[in-house]
């Protein structure tokens, strides 16, 4: 049987809405023939299900086998190193992978200008893997909130922050002209999920966008 292989030092999930990735760190001094076995346990069904016998990557997309995450008690995963006939002990994720572990994101942010206001529309994520009935707004049906960060370009990177409770928002520019850049971070007030800031979207506001009224 030879010397025992060391176990992967760390195993954890990183996830966005219907994008569930298991990660692990490699064993020290792994050889070119070292690979990793991945198994999954669904809470309530107390048996481990082998997902991959020999993955040579250090991450594995488990979305397809965890599609019921948002209607379940969650999962644990475990990984072990395999090299020929030798294998290590399992390393198990040290937290339950549940809906609480999903990082919230937005699909995109669209900006337009009307009467000196910046009007924003937040597009929610629409992942291809999601079952038809499992939309972001049906799973997170209440208390959706969005932190809005605005900066004026050129500027000294001081942000104006605002929290909104709808996917549509408006920002008053106080008659200023220039380029305004907006980022959005979603949250759900009743949940503890982390949120990821969106990429910045920018829009230029010039005098032509202001309506003159007597």
């Amino acid at each position: 049987h030879g010397t025992e292989l060391p176990s992967p030092p760390s195993v954890w999930f990183e996830a966005e809405f219907f994008h569930h990735i298991l990660h692990w760190t490699p064993i020290p001094n792994q050889s070119e023939s070292t690979c990793y076995e991945v198994a999954l346990l669904r809470y309530g069904i107390e048996s481990w299900n082998s997902i991959s016998n020999c993955s040579q990557t250090l991450s594995y997309d488990l979305t397809a086998v965890t599609l019921d995450l948002y209607h379940s008690n969650g999962y644990r995963a475990r990984v072990r190193a395999v090299d020929g006939s030798r294998h290590s002990n399992w390393t198990v994720t040290n937290t339950r992978f549940s809906v609480d572990e999903v990082t919230l994101t937005v699909g995109s942010v669209n900006l337009e200008i009307h009467n000196g206001f910046i009007l924003g529309k937040i597009q929610l994520p629409r992942p291809k893997m999601a079952p038809a009935n499992d939309t972001y707004e049906s799973i997170f049906s209440h208390f959706r909130e969005y932190e809005i960060a605005i900066r004026k370009v050129p500027g000294n990177f001081t942000f104006t922050h605002k929290k909104v409770k709808h996917e549509n928002f408006s920002l008053l520019t106080s008659g200023e002209v220039g380029e305004f850049c907006v980022q959005v971070k979603p949250s759900v007030a009743s949940r503890s999920n982390k949120g990821m800031w969106s990429k910045e979207e920018c829009i230029s506001l010039t005098r032509q966008y202001f309506t003159v009224t007597n």
């Epitope: 990183e14 990735i21 942000f159």
Partner: nanobody, 124 residues
Framework: QLQLLESGGGLVQPGGSLRLSCAAS????????MGWFRQAPGKGREFVSA????????YYAESVKGRFTISKDNSKNTLYLQMNSLRAEDTAVYYC?????????????????WGQGTMVTVSS
């Protein structure tokens, strides 16, 4: 907007050491992890090392294993790369990047924010 600013590059003799730093600024810092990539003159950008931002877990390219050490200071939003036993083939521009996708730590595509880079030259 997240800004990443690398520092610590310079000219060093073979066998010498350098410590690179990357300061993340801007109130909108959020990332799964952070990484270092490098681009040697006339070559493509390659993965060097990465670290989880919350929790334990580090990755290294085979070419730097045992010589480079990645670390972080969450309270300062700062990433480090301690580079020992430097070789001529380590000469490159080193880029710090923030991982904003749950996909692989080793892939450039997982990183949504990049610094401007700092030059490391290893020469006698």
């Amino acid at each position: 907007q997240l800004q990443l600013l690398e520092s610590g590059g310079g000219l060093v003799q073979p066998g010498g050491s350098l410590r690179l730093s990357c300061a993340a600024s801007g109130r909108t810092f959020s990332a799964y992890g952070m990484g270092w990539f490098r681009q040697a003159p006339g070559k493509g950008r390659e993965f060097v090392s990465a670290i989880r931002w919350f929790g334990e877990g580090t990755y290294y390219a085979e070419s730097v294993k045992g010589r480079f050490t990645i670390s972080k200071d969450n309270s300062k939003n700062t990433l480090y790369l301690q580079m020992n036993s430097l070789r001529a083939e380590d000469t490159a521009v080193y880029y710090c990047a923030a991982k904003t996708s749950p996909t692989s730590y080793l892939s450039e595509k997982s990183y949504g924010y990049w610094g401007q880079g700092t030059m490391v030259t290893v020469s006698s």
